[in-house]
Interface confidence: medium
């Protein structure tokens, strides 16, 4: 089941999946002068079977004006694309993403994509939230959205995630350095994500399943 | 059900200090943020700031900078806000309110505690 | 600090009439804009949020519109447990409200 909305936009925040649900749709976008070739897919599909899941189809751009010259897909790991409505700033990085049963990775750039990616995400897609540059959160550890299907309609739930302006004094001025976690946890630059349905403030969790490591930096 | 019980009602001199305490039940105290909310006799409401429950943090309104300190006791599950140097015009009703819910964003009030009378006067 | 205006301040209407409340935010705050509801000697009450969800429990009869610097509250058929002081509120910067509209009995 597709779900119906793009995921919360959280001021001066970004948003970033680290795996892809099976079903999930990755639309074949150009970038300005090129189009898709005309044979190829619009779009491409996480699908696999119980033990491996991977994007069926490939997509492939062509210059506008050369009518026959198709661009193989080649990967170029510099560009690293971001879905639509995102401005990520390269704050997420993957540590060590392990592959997760019955998701996808993110697809590898191809030639002359577009600058942002459209996804179309699936009941039960979970994406990360973070802080753009020049704002930090009121909180340390990661913020996330899941796509829920409740009473028949699909929602996501609501990251409990604020970013402070560090410059700008309308954005929540005067913040205070964070104290040391409650629960005693030690916070410490790379929070350990657990895949859970609790969106609310994220405090720094001891993962039992080590499915990934998120890379956040705090000022 | 979520529940916040503030304090009872005070009355300061001007140049004094107020601490109102608000406490949380029937949720995780530290898995939302708290927001403190003033509004003055016959007056619109006005915000002040937010705390952080799990780590602490804090952010304020301009207007209060420097005044207002909002701090947490975890094992209680309070939050307070405490107001200094006050003036006449900080005579007000002074509310904690939780932010967000499930499917609501942080910065908005889907929870208030009844409300704090403070008076200040000579 | 982005500033809310709410008009009218009061609006006189009967049991079963049509409020429309209207907020001007001074610059956009796209659809990040919420509606609280207060009675006398009570704590305000969510009723919409981001511009047109209401809030857990909130009748259908309560509705909102509008994005970027205009919003508007409507209340299809008052009630006569609906007349009260509304405000409403954006959220993408330092929180503000409006300064309220009164809906009084006629």
């Known amino acids: 089941e597709l779900c119906d909305d793009d995921p919360p936009k959280i001021t001066h925040a970004t948003f970033k999946a680290v795996a892809y649900k099976e079903g999930t749709m990755l639309n074949c976008e150009c970038k300005r002068g090129f189009r898709r070739i005309k044979s190829g897919s619009p779009y491409m599909l996480c699908t696999g079977n119980s033990s491996h899941s991977s994007w069926d189809n490939q997509c492939q751009c062509t210059s506008s004006a050369a009518r026959n010259t198709t661009k193989q897909v080649t990967p170029q790991p510099e560009e690293q694309k971001e879905r639509k409505t995102t401005e990520m700033q390269s704050q997420m990085q993957l540590a060590d993403q392990v592959s997760l049963p019955g998701h996808c990775r993110e697809p590898p750039p191809w030639e002359n994509e577009a600058t942002e990616r459209i996804y179309h995400f699936v009941v039960g897609q979970t994406v990360y939230y973070q802080c753009v540059q020049g704002y930090r959160a009121l909180h340390r550890g990661p913020a996330e959205s899941v796509c829920k299907m409740t009473h028949g309609k699909t929602r996501w739930t609501q990251p409990q995630l604020i970013c402070t302006g560090e410059t700008e004094p309308s954005q929540f001025p005067g913040e205070e350095e964070p104290q040391a976690s409650p629960d005693g946890l030690p916070e410490s630059e790379t929070s350990r994500l657990v895949t859970t349905t609790d969106f609310r403030i994220q405090t720094e969790v001891a993962a039992t399943m080590e499915t990934f490591i998120f890379t956040t930096e705090y000022q | 059900q979520v529940q916040l019980v503030q304090s009872g009602a005070e009355v300061k001199k001007p140049g004094a200090s107020v601490k109102v305490s608000c406490k949380a039940s029937g949720y995780t105290f530290t898995s939302y943020y708290m927001h403190w909310v003033r509004q003055a006799p016959g007056q619109g409401l006005e915000w002040m700031g937010i705390i952080n429950p799990s780590g602490g943090s804090t952010s304020y309104a301009q207007k209060f900078q420097g005044r207002v300190t909002m701090t947490r006791d975890t094992s209680t599950s309070t939050v307070y806000m405490e107001l200094s140097s006050l003036r006449s015009e900080d005579t007000a009703v002074y509310y904690c309110?939780?932010?967000?819910?499930?499917?609501?964003?942080?910065?908005?009030?889907?929870?208030w505690g009844q409300g704090t009378l403070v008076t200040v006067s000579s | 600090e982005i500033v809310m205006t709410q008009s009218p301040a009061t609006l006189s209407l009967s049991p079963g009439e049509r409020a429309t409340l209207s907020c001007r935010a001074s610059?956009?705050?796209?659809?990040?804009l919420a509606w609280y509801q207060q009675k006398p000697g009570q704590a305000p009450r969510l009723l919409i949020y981001d511009a047109s969800n209401r809030a857990t429990g909130i009748p259908a009869r309560f509705s909102g519109s509008g994005s970027g610097t205009d919003f508007t509250l409507t209340i299809s058929s008052l009630e006569p447990e609906d007349f009260a002081v509304y405000y409403c509120?954006?959220?993408?910067?330092?929180?503000?409200f409006g300064g309220g509209t009164k809906v009084e009995i006629k």
């Open positions: 610059q956009s705050v796209s659809s990040y």
């Open positions: 509120q954006q959220r993408p910067f330092l929180p503000t």
């Open positions: 309110a939780r932010g967000g819910a499930e499917y609501i964003p942080a910065e908005y009030f889907q929870h």
